[in-house]
């Protein structure tokens, strides 16, 4: 089945942008001016997920790259990674659960909860230039709130 998708950038609640850090990692840092062009453009897709009150299941791919954010266990810990996929088959309505995030939107702030690991969220550190990761705490030191802006083609 066809999938609704959009192109966007994400910034954490401290206005840090997300950029590539090597081939399979994202990091968060403050960007200004022309450096804003470095920020990653996501292709966010509306996918199938478990029934819930007001969580919206999405997949987060990197625009025009065959990479998707996914959640897997590494050394017994839920971990965020960029995973390569076959572009002929993605995005699709029924994404594997490791690719699915529950988008939670409150007062124009977005959280992305792992569908595979409930209560684990896409997170950034307070510190500059640190990797984007999957965090198991909300409301602590680490940042789990993001804003989204459409990207004009």
């Amino acid at each position: 089945a066809p999938v609704r998708s959009l192109n966007c950038t994400l910034r954490d609640s401290q206005q840090k942008s997300l950029v590539m850090s090597g081939p399979y990692e994202l990091k968060a840092l403050h960007l200004q001016g022309q450096d804003m062009e470095q920020q990653v453009v996501f292709s966010m897709s509306f996918v199938q997920g478990e029934e819930s009150n007001d969580k919206i299941p999405v997949a987060l791919g990197l625009k025009e790259k065959n990479l998707y954010l996914s959640c897997v266990l590494k050394d017994d810990k839920p971990t965020l990674q960029l995973e390569s996929v076959d572009p002929k088959n993605y995005p699709k309505k029924k994404m594997e659960k490791r690719f699915v995030f529950n988008k939670i939107e409150i007062n124009n702030k977005l959280e992305f909860e792992s569908a595979q690991f409930p209560n684990w969220y896409i997170s950034t550190s307070q510190a500059e230039n640190m990797p984007v990761f999957l965090g198991g705490t909300k409301g602590g030191q680490d940042i789990t709130d993001f804003t989204m802006q459409f990207v004009s083609s």
Partner: antibody, heavy 119, light 107 residues
């Protein structure tokens, strides 16, 4: 306060074209999706299509080809270009804001603009 | 394409009545269903989203229930301002966002 105001409706001949506008305030088109919905006289609501970013637009199957949704974020304005108009396109046209990204439901509506297709 | 069918098409009721409107989807849509109220010459107003969540500012006499392919909108005690047309809407059906044909609630 969220406000949506449609304009551009009027009388057009069959086969003609018309561009409707929807100017919004109280929120930004750079972070909300927008739909167009129409209602023929005495009939129900009919979804036309939705726009996210400028490259991501989706249409009802019947609207593909004749109807085009676009927007100018800097002007806070949404557009509906309608071509090859027919008598059955006579309706009130509403713009509406999607409550949340991909939620599908619409929590803000304009007052509507009337399009009459007649010779 | 998923088709949404409302019943009844018209419904007569009195102030104080409990009213139930039904919406059926031609296939399962989970809880991706919304309800709207529309008064003559006005824009629709969102009442319920995700089948059972009350939209902001909507009186608590309105409630929604259901999942899968069958849904209901209930008005517990009809008020004079509730006479209007009600529409259900499939909000999660892939590309298409389809409305039911409407239920007109009259005195």
């Amino acid at each position: 306060e969220v406000q949506l105001v449609e304009s551009g409706g009027g009388l057009v001949q069959p086969g003609g074209s018309l561009r409707l506008s929807c100017t919004v305030s109280g929120f930004s088109l750079s972070s909300y999706a927008m739909s167009w919905v129409r209602q023929a006289p005495g009939k129900g609501l009919e979804w036309i299509g939705i726009i996210y970013d400028s490259a991501s637009t989706y249409y009802a199957s019947w609207a593909k080809g004749r109807f085009t949704i676009s927007k100018d974020t800097s002007k806070n304005t949404l557009y509906l270009q309608m071509n090859s108009l027919r008598a059955e396109d006579t309706a009130v046209y509403f713009c509406a804001r999607e409550r949340q990204i991909f939620s599908g439901d619409m929590d803000g509506w304009g007052q509507g603009t009337t399009v009459t297709v007649s010779s | 394409e998923i088709v949404m069918t409302q019943s009844p098409s018209t419904l007569s009721a009195s102030v104080g009545d409990r009213v139930i409107i039904t919406c059926r989807a031609s296939q399962s849509i989970g809880n991706w269903l919304s309800w709207y109220q529309q008064k003559p010459g006005k824009a629709p107003k969102l009442l319920i989203y995700r089948a059972s969540n009350l939209a902001s500012g909507v009186p608590s006499r309105f409630s929604g229930s259901g999942s899968g392919a069958e849904f209901t909108l209930t008005i517990s005690s009809l008020q004079p301002e509730d006479f209007a047309t009600y529409y259900c809407q499939n909000t999660g059906g892939g590309i298409n966002i389809a409305f039911g044909q409407g239920t007109k609630l009259t005195v």
